[in-house]
């Protein structure tokens, strides 16, 4: 999946299996991504567990687990706040589109998660204090998480090696270098960037991300998934002048 | 193995009041030296983690990227408090302590918002 | 919870071979180190040997240098150790153990070798 | 390889009296980079080690306040404020400075 860090780092990596993407006292979260295609080193998200932590007198420990065509809007025990303590609706669950798109509130850590189900796969996004991402005490116990260090060198797929401003060869070039089996019906260059064009028209990190997604996969649901995690950016991002990613080696415009 | 305290002591110097620091800036690269600095500590019991070897990795790729000379000054990690978790000893009938912003609000001024992102493939 | 649980241990000749697995839950298992440590019969501890997250290095006790190899599959969050040539002082209880430097253990298996 | 030399290999307690173990290296166990890789392990009857003390004073998680560590270079004591009978087993040292990785033979606590 590609992941944009709380440092505002923009990488595509291809984990597979459970890892942390958030690790501190107060919550953890945990994306399991599988590949898109037989033999893919791409992969994309299928499930995210969430635990909120017990918290003083606010909320009881909670979890929040969404699959591949299971997007609850409720707790594993069936609930949609924290509990029975007294600041219980601190801690909400709302459900904006049945099935699609949910967002939870943790009030009392300043936080608000969104997880939507875009086609087979899910897509999480994130507005938390520094402090409460900083705040983590048993280094020992507490693992890597993607959220702040990124993705090890070792999982990343470049993206440069991949996205090309230039069509012909160049498409080709990219077409050619892409990290899946062809897709069952894998987008012509042009095609894909016409597509993306449509729903992303700035040309930034995103938009390259549902380039490389739909000639990865051939699946358009991507091109969603691209333009609902950049509107959950403008949501959720407190510095509007970093909305938009672009890679280091372009200008920015204006 | 503390490798996840130079990861995020490094996150700390990096992350400005307002802002995080620029990229290109000495104090980031003094950032990143401490960073180097932290990780060679954990070296002996962290050196079969994932952990580790990412992070020796990613400050070798960013001193490249930012071209920061491996000799120079390092920089301090600023400290944050934040009430505990789990049940604390001291119970109030006041909800602000079950909203971040006003009980933060008494300490400082607006909290520093950060986001992260996953998406696609 | 970090869960440590160790397998196929049993009784098996001298110069024989065995085989044991330790499966693991409730952490991230290709971000550690793991090690391996066993304990004879009244006996105090001994480190066997560790490897790293990835496979790419590994470390033996001289004891059983060449005679026993540690492995991991990531994908099913299992580490291995392959003990051969076994002889009468590897009896003992076999522990795995979670990180570079251990600090969770299985409740180990047993190993005996014994004509 | 690094030899550790605990003693008392045997430690008879009383009930809420404190207790002590010394852990002795035959080498230095300072790392280069001025780190003490030395851990304190305890092994309850018919259970599995359970790590207490890791880089000679820091109390794992979950560890009560009564344990604590303390030494340097090679000599490393491990003390026990009040003896709980939970606290019944055997006691090891363990370095993790020098491979390989080595442990003390094991100090036995029992309740008097």
């Known amino acids: 999946p590609h992941l944009r860090t709380f440092t505002d780092r923009f990488q595509t990596c291809k984990v597979q299996g459970a890892w942390p993407l958030i690790d501190n006292n107060y919550l953890n979260v945990q994306a399991t991504n599988t590949p898109v295609l037989p033999g893919s080193a791409a992969t994309a998200t299928s499930k995210l567990t969430i635990i909120f932590k017990n918290f003083q007198e606010c909320v009881d420990q909670k979890v929040y687990q969404a699959e591949m065509d299971e997007l609850p809007a409720a707790f594993v025990d069936g609930s949609k706040n924290g509990g029975d303590k007294h600041g219980a609706n601190s801690l909400k669950i709302t459900e904006k589109v049945s099935g699609q798109h949910v967002e939870i509130q943790a009030k009392y850590i300043g936080t608000t998660i969104v997880v939507r189900q875009v086609g087979r796969y899910l897509t999480f996004a994130v507005r938390m204090p520094e402090e409460v991402v900083n705040a983590v005490e048993d280094w020992d116990s507490q693992g890597l998480y993607l959220c702040l260090r990124g993705c090890p060198l070792n999982q990343q797929i470049d993206f440069q090696a991949f996205h090309t401003n230039a069509e012909g060869t160049g498409a080709r070039r990219l077409a050619a270098a892409s990290p899946a089996p062809t897709a069952p019906e894998t987008f012509p260059y042009e095609t894909a960037v016409a597509k993306c064009k449509e729903k992303l028209p700035v040309e930034d990190l995103y938009y390259q991300a549902c380039v490389f997604d739909l000639l990865t996969t051939g699946d358009v649901n991507f091109t969603l998934a691209a333009y609902y995690a950049l509107e959950d950016v403008k949501m959720l991002h407190s510095n509007k002048d970093k909305l938009h990613l672009y890679e280091r080696t372009r200008d920015l415009p204006g | 193995c503390k490798i996840l305290k130079c990861n995020s002591e490094f996150w700390s110097a990096t992350s400005g009041s307002h802002a995080p620091a620029s990229d290109d800036t000495p104090e980031f690269c003094a950032a990143l030296r401490s960073y180097a600095l932290c990780t060679r500590r954990t070296a002996r019991t962290c050196r079969g983690d994932l952990a580790y070897h990412s992070a020796v990795h990613g400050i070798e790729d960013l001193m490249s990227q930012h071209n920061c000379s491996k000799d120079g000054p390092t920089s301090q990690p600023r400290l944050r408090t934040l009430p505990p978790a789990g049940d604390s000893q001291e119970r109030s009938d006041s909800p602000e302590i079950c909203h971040y912003e006003k009980s933060f609000h008494k300490h400082s001024a607006t909290p520093n918002y950060t986001h992260c992102g996953l998406f696609g493939d | 919870e970090v869960q440590l649980v160790e397998s196929g241990g049993g009784l098996v000749q001298p110069g024989g071979s065995l085989r044991l697995s330790c499966a693991a839950s409730g952490f991230t298992f290709s971000n550690y180190g793991m090690n391996w440590i066993r304990q004879a019969p009244g006996k105090g501890l001994e480190w066997i040997g560790m490897i790293y997250y990835d496979s790419s290095e590994k470390h033996y006790a001289d004891s059983v240098k060449g005679r026993f190899t540690i492995s991991r599959d990531n994908s099913k969050n299992t580490l291995y150790l392959q003990m051969n040539s076994l002889r009468a002082e590897d009896t003992a209880v076999y522990y795995c153990?979670?990180?570079?430097?251990?600090?969770?253990w299985g409740q180990g298996t047993m190993v005996t070798v014994s004509s | 390889d690094v030899v550790l030399t605990q003693s008392p290999l045997s430690l008879p307690v009383t009930l809420g009296q404190p207790a002590s173990i010394s852990c002795r290296s035959s080498q230095s166990l300072e790392y280069s980079d001025g780190y003490t890789f030395l851990e304190w392990f305890l092994q309850k009857p018919g259970q599995s080690p359970q790590l207490l003390i890791y880089e000679v004073s820091n109390r794992f998680s979950g560890v009560p306040d009564r344990f604590s560590g303390s030494g340097s270079g090679t000599d490393f004591t491990l003390k026990i404020s009040r003896v709980e009978a939970e606290d019944v087993g055997v006691y090891y040292c363990f370095q993790a400075t020098h491979d390989p990785l080595t442990f003390g033979q094991g100090t036995k606590l029992e309740i008097k």
């Open positions: 153990a979670k990180g570079t430097t251990p600090d969770y």
